[in-house]
C-alpha cells in the first residue's frame, strides 16, 4: 500500500475580482482496488447515497474529475446499496479520473479496498484518515472551487500545475 | 439542446455603460459555472469573465477589473455582464459560455455573441 | 499570466489530408487544454477538453494529445465542413487565455 500525496488546490476570488489559490499537502494510500497512479482534477464531493442511484445526472459530468466521499459509520448504513468498492466502480463510469474515500468513521472500509480483487479498477482509489481527511473535508465542505492533484510521489513543486 | 442567446448590444460612447444578457436554456442552470468571452474585430479571443453556480465568486483579467461586472439569476436563468467605464478597445462581439461541470475554466457551449460598439 | 503560441496561423490542406495544429503554453498547464473550431459568424465549437477527450457529439477523426507545455489538435482525413478557424484555450488557472488561432483552408 503505496503513499499517495494529494494536493488540494482552492480557487477563491474577492469581491474585486481578485483570484487566490491556496494549495493543501496532505497524504493517503493508494488501496488495491485501484491503480497506483497520478491523477488530477476538479473535486466533486460525492455522498455515499448519490451514489446508489442510477439517474440522469450521468451526462452531467466531463470525464476527469476527482470523487471525494466522506464514508460513515457502518451502523447508519447497515444495508449500503452498494460496497465501497462499488462506490468507487460506480464513480469511475461516471467519469471520475481518481476516487478518495474518507475512511475516519468507517475503518473496515481499508480492508475491503484493500481486499485483492481479480478486476482492480484502472483508476486511483485512495483513502484518507485522521487529520489528513480532515484537512480535506475542510476545503471540500466550504463547496469551493478546488482541485487535486494525486502523485505517487512527492510533488517536487507543489504549485506548479496551479500557479494562478 | 444547449442554448446561450445573448442580448444588449449596441453603440455606446467611451466613459458610458452597457448591459448585456444571456438567456440560457437546455440545461439546469444553477447547477453550471458561465462566462463571458470577448472576440475584436480581426482579432483573438479574451477571457472576460467567470462566476460560480451560486454567484459567490467572480474572476476578472486585470483588462476589465473594476470597470466590468458579471452576475447572474438563477431563477431566470439569465447571465449579466455590466459594462461600466468602456474604452474604445472594449469593442467587440462579447460571447456567454457555459462551463463544462465540473468547475469553472473550461467552456463547453457558446452563444453566438453580441456586438459591442465603443465609440464617439 | 500564460501565454498560448499557436502555429501555424495558416494552414492549406485538401479533402482527406491529416493535419495537426499546435500550441505551446509559456508553462506547464497540465491537462488544461481544451480545442475549438469556429466557422465565419458562428459561435465557437468545443472539440477535445482537457488534452484528450473528444467532446460528446464530435466526430472521431479529431484527436488531441501532448502535456506539459506542448498541444496538438490533429485532423485525420480532412472533410470539407473541417475547412475553419480553430483555436486552443489553456484553463489551468486564471486569467484563462487563448491561442491567437489557425485558419484552415483549402488548397
Known amino acids: 500500500k503505496e503513499t499517495a500525496f494529494v494536493e488540494v488546490v482552492l480557487f477563491e476570488s474577492s469581491p474585486s475580482g481578485d483570484y487566490t489559490t491556496y494549495t493543501t499537502g496532505l497524504t493517503g494510500r493508494f488501496s488495491r482496488a485501484g491503480a497506483t497512479l497520478s491523477a488530477e482534477g476538479e473535486i466533486v464531493q460525492m455522498h455515499p447515497l448519490g451514489l446508489c442511484n442510477n439517474n440522469d445526472e450521468e451526462d452531467l459530468y466531463e470525464y476527469g474529475w476527482v470523487g471525494v466521499v466522506k464514508l460513515e459509520q457502518p451502523e447508519l448504513d447497515p444495508k449500503p446499496c452498494l460496497t465501497v468498492l462499488g462506490k468507487a466502480k460506480r464513480a469511475v463510469q461516471r467519469g471520475a479520473t481518481a476516487v478518495i474515500f474518507d475512511v475516519s468513521e468507517n475503518p473496515e472500509a481499508i480492508d475491503q479496498l484493500n481486499q485483492g480483487s481479480e478486476d482492480p479498477l484502472k483508476r486511483p482509489v485512495v483513502y484518507v484518515k485522521g487529520a489528513d481527511a480532515i484537512k480535506l473535508m475542510n476545503i471540500v465542505n466550504k463547496q469551493k472551487v478546488a482541485r487535486a492533484r494525486i502523485q505517487h510521489r512527492p510533488p517536487r513543486q507543489p504549485t506548479e500545475y496551479f500557479d494562478m | 439542446e444547449v442554448q446561450l442567446v445573448e442580448s444588449g448590444g449596441g453603440l455606446v460612447q467611451p466613459g458610458r455603460s452597457l448591459k448585456v444578457s444571456c438567456a440560457a436554456s437546455?440545461?439546469?442552470?444553477?447547477?453550471?459555472?458561465m462566462a463571458w468571452v470577448r472576440q475584436a474585430p480581426k482579432k483573438g479571443l479574451e477571457w472576460v469573465a467567470t462566476i460560480t453556480p451560486g454567484g459567490s465568486n467572480t474572476y476578472y483579467p486585470d483588462s476589465v477589473k473594476g470597470r466590468f461586472t458579471i452576475s447572474r439569476d438563477n431563477a431566470k436563468s439569465t447571465l449579466y455582464l455590466q459594462m461600466d467605464s468602456l474604452r474604445s478597445e472594449d469593442t467587440a462581439n462579447y460571447y456567454c459560455?457555459?462551463?463544462?461541470?465540473?468547475?469553472?475554466?473550461?467552456?463547453?457551449?457558446w452563444g453566438q455573441g453580441v456586438m459591442v460598439t465603443v465609440s464617439s | 499570466d500564460i501565454q498560448m503560441t499557436q502555429s501555424p496561423s495558416f494552414l492549406s490542406a485538401s479533402v482527406g489530408d491529416r493535419v495537426s495544429i499546435n500550441c505551446k503554453a509559456s508553462?506547464?498547464?497540465?491537462?488544461?487544454l481544451n480545442w475549438y473550431q469556429q466557422e465565419l459568424g458562428e459561435a465557437p465549437k468545443r472539440l477535445i477538453y482537457?488534452?484528450?477527450n473528444l467532446q460528446t457529439g464530435i466526430p472521431s477523426r479529431f484527436s488531441g494529445s501532448g502535456s506539459g507545455t506542448d498541444y496538438t489538435l490533429t485532423i485525420s482525413g480532412l472533410q470539407p465542413e473541417d475547412f475553419a478557424t480553430y483555436f486552443c484555450l489553456q484553463h489551468n488557472g486564471f486569467p484563462l487565455t487563448f491561442g491567437s488561432g489557425t485558419k484552415l483552408e483549402i488548397k
Open positions: 459560455a457555459k462551463c463544462g461541470y465540473p468547475g469553472i475554466t473550461s467552456f463547453d457551449y
Open positions: 508553462q506547464n498547464i497540465g491537462k488544461y
Open positions: 437546455g440545461f439546469t442552470f444553477s447547477t453550471f459555472a
Open positions: 482537457n488534452t484528450n
